[in-house]
């Protein structure tokens, strides 16, 4: 008999475990794009916004080839934290204006749990180390105005987008090493 | 400082219309969201409406859906409240208020609309 | 009736500590901020508490807010007599779109 009907398909191939992250993370991919591209439409932004409490992005174009899985996985999955914590906040304290967008995020904010949910399964897996955030994680603070949260909202949402872009390449490259 | 002024209240008969207005000043008014809450003499707050930023979003309370709308004017940092149908149980001090997200950090004074005939 | 459920009323004596209860639900207070605003008499509600456990600036630390689940509370600890006033919390309600209060809890402070 095969596993107990809801626990996860046990796999002894890491590459297997791999392309089912990259699929969760297009997926999460383009529901972010397309979400990006509906608060575009919605609420227009003038240039580009940003949020300090947001992490850096991990990988560039110049990082790709020195990238290590134990690395890429666990810096992936504390940068994906934060995000999640963001769209958290932004459901919560967004005022009305994000309300209308609140199918949507809460969509987004399940695919995020599940992406995490799978990194951290690969990487017991792999018998990786379940790293903690390297600072603290400090409260997010209410955001100073209305369109200050819509401003959070584009930069949230376009850091998201960035970070799972180069997730799917820096897993694809990795997935080739295996 | 913030300030918000509401005007427009006054005695009023069943059916009939009003219109109240919330003059906003010490802040930049277009940043914020706006809501309209209420409270009948000796009875708790019932909130309104509220409004976008920007205007393009509104949602009403149940009870007032339909009769009421909720307007701004960012270039005259005006917010309005235009009360048409109105009932007896509408009576009640209005008051606009100002939120950043979640919480009304600033409220005016308020402006008693009595319905009456 | 309000969607928000808070005791009409509490009452205490200088110095003691009073908390007053605000029971909502998953679309409400499990889902969203709680607020909570002082009334006194006469006058217009007072921003208290905000993100269901912050005070705005100028508001005495005896007042503090926490929420669990889908209830929240309002602690006042060293009661003073200015204290005596209408306590509402308030919350996003994600099935209604919109703001509910509580119908208000009436503080007084004895002797």
């Known amino acids: 008999p095969g596993p107990p009907a809801g626990s996860p398909r046990v796999s002894s191939d890491p590459r297997a475990d791999l392309d089912s992250a990259v699929l969760l993370t297009r997926s999460l991919l383009a529901d972010t794009r397309q979400l990006a591209a509906q608060m575009r439409d919605k609420f227009p932004a003038d240039g580009d916004h940003s949020l300090d409490s947001l992490p850096t992005l991990a990988m560039s174009a110049g990082t790709l080839g020195s990238l290590q899985l134990p690395g890429v996985l666990t810096r992936l999955r504390v940068d994906l934290m934060s995000y999640l914590r963001h769209v958290q906040w932004l459901r919560r304290a967004g005022g009305p204006s994000l309300k209308t967008l609140e199918p949507e995020l809460g969509a987004l904010q399940a695919r995020l749990e599940r992406l995490l949910r799978r990194l951290q399964l690969l990487m017991s897996r792999l018998a990786l180390p379940q790293a903690a955030p390297d600072q603290p994680v400090i409260p997010l603070g209410p955001p100073a105005s209305a369109w200050g949260s819509i401003r959070a909202a584009h930069a949230i949402l376009g850091g998201l987008h960035l970070t799972l872009d180069w997730a799917v390449r820096g897993l694809l490259l990795l997935k080739t090493r295996l | 400082q913030v300030q918000l002024v509401e005007s427009g209240g006054g005695v009023v008969q069943p059916g009939r219309s009003l219109r109240l207005s919330c003059a906003a000043s010490g802040f930049t008014f277009s940043h914020y969201d706006m809501h309209w809450v209420r409270q009948a003499p000796g009875k708790g707050l019932e909130w309104v409406a509220v409004i976008s930023y920007s205007g393009s979003v509104k949602f009403y309370a149940d009870s007032v859906k339909g009769r009421f709308t909720i307007s701004r004017d960012n270039s005259k940092n005006t917010l309005y409240l235009q009360m048409n149908s109105l009932r007896a149980e509408d009576t009640a001090v209005y008051y606009c208020?100002?939120?950043?997200?979640?919480?009304?950090?600033?409220w005016g004074q308020g402006t008693l609309v009595t319905v009456s005939s | 009736q309000s969607v928000l459920t808070q005791p009409p009323s509490a009452s205490g004596t200088p110095g003691q500590r009073v908390t007053i209860s605000c029971s909502g639900s998953s679309s409400n207070i499990g889902s969203n901020y709680v607020n909570w605003y002082q009334q006194l008499p006469g006058t217009a509600p007072k921003l208290l508490i905000y993100?269901?456990?912050l005070r705005p600036s100028g508001v005495p630390d005896r007042f503090s807010g926490s929420k669990s689940g889908t209830s929240a509370s309002l602690a006042i600890s060293g009661l003073r007599s200015e204290d005596e006033a209408d306590y509402y919390c308030?919350?996003?309600?994600?099935?209604?779109?919109?703001?509910?209060f509580g119908g208000g809890t009436k503080l007084t402070v004895l002797g």
């Open positions: 208020a100002r939120t950043p997200g979640s919480h009304f950090d600033y």
């Open positions: 993100y269901d456990d």
């Open positions: 308030s919350a996003w309600d994600d099935s209604l779109s919109g703001v509910v």
